[in-house]
Interface confidence: low
């Protein structure tokens, strides 16, 4: 049985094409503003975008098993289509100006088109031929085509208004669309040629689909769903009236999803995405920032990248020739991310959420979420307010500062407490960065009227002030052990400085056009920083050859940035604290000669075995 499916903001409804009635809502909960709509006939599922919730969801035709398959990094997902052969989901986002793909369950998401894309809107797929088609509304509206892996892009119809409801007649090989500026329904061949006007007397055609000899469209002025002969535009019938703002319309029938390509068989033997390309071919695709291996089938995760956080999102950026776009990592319930770090050994992301007053960790795909540090009492005098964190990857510890207690704490990566290593009556430690290769930590101490940058051994001993003059509010620290350099940003003085790890050779790296630096990190020969007020990520070449470069702009509510370098496991294992924390029960320190010494947090003392800590 064939039936019409249409989205009408808060609900999705169906009408039998046999009886032309039975306008019934599919029983879905939580739909706010359904926009684009498609289906997978073999699975008997419908897919829709919600431009209010900024999600893509799916459910069975009876309304069961409703789930959000994409819920991060969407702004205005106006167009969406199901690749029924490769079992992929494609969507066009008018807000982010991206066309993306994922598996039907939202896994293995990749950005296919992101350059020179201006408000992409309607999207249609021809998976048997390996092409995707879309309309753009911004600048000079047009209809474009590309291979389904994003390659071979070309403009088919340049002289068109805001085209919507793009649909393909797979049998007769024609494109159909509505034009919101001219109020026409038009058609062309698959190359954009042999263009014909099907209807020119409609007040406001919007959504459109084709089935057998008919086109079906929605009209926002007539508040109707209508149909007519697809070639002549004659024999018009009103299918349903009194319908406000029908966003998308399609015919659910197996004939709309026929054909075959290589991806339909065992996913083309691809480990992640199988993407159709013309003519009748395919390529294996990888999730965003992953790279295709030499076998052209499997993918490898990125090992070198930048992470940056916004108030309620953590993003990943890679530096590559294609200038791949950054992506939002699918991590739930971020309220107010203040600081981030990364453990390259377990490939886990750590962050401080200052709204929830906790330190949490998760895999980059959002799985294995775990609260490492949490306040136990929601009282007015909050017992902990984590401010900054830094991971000692060898001992598997987090060093973190606390605004409430004004101490530096150490916690194991599994959440078990080690103890306090630095505490003083006047201390207000804030930014912190560890250098476990040398056994030191560096921190800013925002004491009243006398801010300082200090260094101490990882157990809090050997404490020394590196800088006390020429500082106002040193808010962020970064360290490069390879270069032997310390970097800091002062948000009051609006400058970025550096020195050797001993505090010698202090120089101002940048002091012009910096408004609110809040995070720093070193990545290869570049120092990256974020400017919250200018909503910008910038970098400066530390060799002095290439100067200062803007990396990203218009990113709201930036809070931190962190570079991740590939972990050399051989080097890692050579660190004396990497094997079972050097045998220490608490803190493992590297001495100048490369040997280790065990130490303890402030409330404990080292016992006679010089490995264990106990009560004094």
């Amino acid at each position: 049985e064939a039936f019409l499916l249409f989205s009408r903001r808060a609900d999705i409804r169906r009408i039998s094409l046999e009886t032309n009635n039975n306008n019934v809502a599919i029983p879905l909960t939580g739909v706010k503003e359904a926009s684009a709509l498609d289906f997978d006939v073999t699975d008997n599922r419908i897919y829709w975008t919600d431009i209010s919730l900024k999600t893509i969801s799916r459910a069975f035709m009876n309304g069961s098993a409703l789930e959000h398959v994409v819920e991060f990094g969407l702004d205005a997902p106006a167009g969406m289509a199901v690749d029924w052969l490769g079992k992929n989901l494609y969507w066009a986002d008018t807000g982010t100006n991206r066309i993306e793909v994922s598996k039907l369950d939202g896994q293995h998401r990749q950005v296919l088109v992101w350059k020179d894309l201006d408000s992409p809107r309607a999207l249609a797929l021809d998976p048997a031929e390996g092409f995707m088609y879309w309309t753009e509304w911004g600048g000079k509206p047009k209809i474009d085509r590309a291979a389904m892996d994003g390659s071979e892009r070309t403009t088919l119809v340049p002289n068109v208004g805001r085209a919507n409801g793009l649909t393909i007649d797979y049998a007769k090989r024609r494109l159909y669309w509505t034009d919101l500026d001219t109020n026409l329904i038009e058609s062309s061949n698959m190359l954009g040629l042999n263009r014909e006007v099907i209807a020119d007397d409609l007040p406001h055609p919007f959504g459109l689909t084709q089935y057998q000899d008919y086109i079906y469209w929605t009209d926002w002025s007539r508040r109707s769903i209508e149909r007519a002969n697809k070639t002549s535009g004659q024999n018009r019938t009103i299918i349903q009236g009194h319908l406000d703002y029908v966003m998308d319309i399609l015919v659910f029938h197996s004939s709309r999803q026929s054909g075959w390509n290589e991806c339909a068989s065992s996913n083309g033997h691809c480990s992640h995405l199988c993407l159709a390309v013309p003519v009748g071919g395919f390529v294996c695709g990888c999730p965003a920032h992953y790279s295709l291996n030499a076998d052209n089938r499997t993918c490898s995760a990125p090992t070198t990248f930048l992470l940056f956080s916004q108030k309620s999102a953590i993003n990943r950026m890679v530096i590559d020739e294609q200038q791949s776009p950054d992506i939002i990592l699918p991590i739930h319930s971020l309220r107010n991310v203040r600081a981030i770090d990364y453990d390259p050994l377990d490939k886990q992301l750590y962050w401080i959420d200052s709204r929830q007053n906790m330190i949490r960790k998760a895999q980059e795909d959002g799985s294995q979420g775990f609260t490492v540090v949490v306040s136990s009492v929601p009282s007015q005098n909050l017992e902990i307010q984590p401010y900054d964190l830094s991971i000692d990857i060898y001992s598997r510890y987090i060093y973190w500062t606390c605004e409430a207690t004004n101490v530096i704490n150490v916690t194991r990566l599994d959440g078990r407490s080690v103890g306090v290593v630095l505490k003083g009556e006047q201390d207000r430690p804030r930014a912190v960065v560890v250098n476990p290769e040398k056994g030191y930590m560096y921190f800013t101490n925002l004491q009243e009227r006398s801010p300082k940058i200090e260094r101490a051994a990882l157990d809090g001993t050997e404490r020394e002030v590196l800088f006390f003059s020429g500082l106002s509010k040193p808010i962020a620290l970064a360290l490069d052990s390879r270069l032997g350099k310390l970097f800091w940003a002062d948000s009051d003085l609006r400058r970025i400085e550096s020195s050797d790890l001993s505090g010698a050779n202090r120089i101002v790296l940048e002091d012009s056009n910096i408004l609110q630096p809040v995070g720093l990190t070193v990545f290869e020969n570049w120092l990256y920083w974020i400017d919250k007020q200018q909503q910008m990520i910038e970098k400066i070449d530390m060799t002095g050859r290439e100067g200062r470069t803007k990396v990203q702009a218009r990113i709201a509510q930036l809070s931190d940035i962190h570079a991740v370098k590939e972990l050399n496991l051989q080097e890692y294992r050579q660190h004396p604290c990497a094997q079972d924390n050097g045998g220490c029960s608490h803190i493992c320190l590297v001495k100048g000669d490369g040997t280790t010494r065990c130490s303890c947090p402030m409330h404990l003392v080292l016992l006679q075995d010089e490995l264990s800590c106990g009560e004094p």
């Epitope: 319930s333 107010n336 200052s354 709204r355 929830q356 007053n357 906790m358 609260t371 949490v374 306040s375 929601p378 009282s379 007015q380 909050l382 307010q385 605004e403």
Partner: antibody, heavy 119, light 108 residues
């Protein structure tokens, strides 16, 4: 100790705007981590969260009512004000203000003020 | 919005009996993002449990909370006369935070 008190009109006509003030003591909205929320309860019915505001002026509103609600704070006066436009008889309820704590629980409440919407 | 469904709507028990109140979320809300409140007629609600299982200050040990994901339970091990009231659960996993419709614990 922490105290909160709601004040505002007991009777409002349909289509009018309701303005409620929460005056509190025992804590400050200039301290990180604190916030004040509004919750209402129609007679004989369940609690319904309306809005909150916190120390850094972050605001959140009920999805169904956000077009009608505005929340603001006056830190120096220890007051939070909620306005609700286009009142309707179904908005008749006891309106509570409460101190909100991370992580977003209400640990101290005012005694509530009954607002009746009727012509 | 996340919908919280409390059951039963009414629980009729005698003092000294054990009360088990259920709160089910329409979607995953983690293990730490549920609170329970007690409300007596004519009074404002009072926070009992936060973080699913932590007792608020001054709450007797006979009140305990458990659960994670979508299913949560408030248990009163032995009902005292002052425990007869209406109990509400609240989720704060996702905005907007929402309350359940309440369970009334009445004297049998």
């Amino acid at each position: 100790q922490v105290q909160l008190k709601e004040s505002g009109p007991a009777l409002v006509k349909p289509t009018q705007t309701l303005t409620l003030t929460c005056t509190f003591s025992g804590f400050s909205l200039s301290n990180r981590g604190g916030g004040v929320g509004w919750i209402r309860q129609p007679p004989g019915k369940a609690l319904e969260w309306l809005a909150w505001i916190d120390w850094d002026d972050d605001k959140s509103y009920s999805t169904s009512l956000k077009t009608r609600l505005t929340i603001s704070k006056d830190t120096s006066k220890n007051q939070v004000v909620l306005t609700m436009t286009n009142m309707d008889p179904v908005d008749t309820a006891t309106y509570y203000c409460a101190r909100m704590h991370l992580p977003l629980v209400f640990d101290s409440w005012g005694q509530g003020t009954l607002v009746t919407v009727s012509s | 919005d996340i919908v919280l469904t409390q059951s039963p709507a009414t629980l009729s028990l005698s003092p000294g009996e054990r009360a088990t109140l259920s709160c089910r979320a329409s979607q995953f809300i983690g293990s730490r993002y549920l609170a329970w409140y007690q409300q007596k007629p004519g009074q404002a609600p009072r926070l009992l449990i936060y973080g699913a299982s932590n007792r608020a200050t001054g709450v007797p040990a006979r009140f305990s909370g458990s659960g994670s994901g979508t299913d949560f339970t408030l248990t009163i091990s032995s009902l005292e006369p002052e425990d007869f009231a209406t109990y509400y659960c609240q989720q704060y996993y996702d905005y907007p935070q929402t309350f359940g419709q309440g369970t009334k614990v009445e004297i049998k």
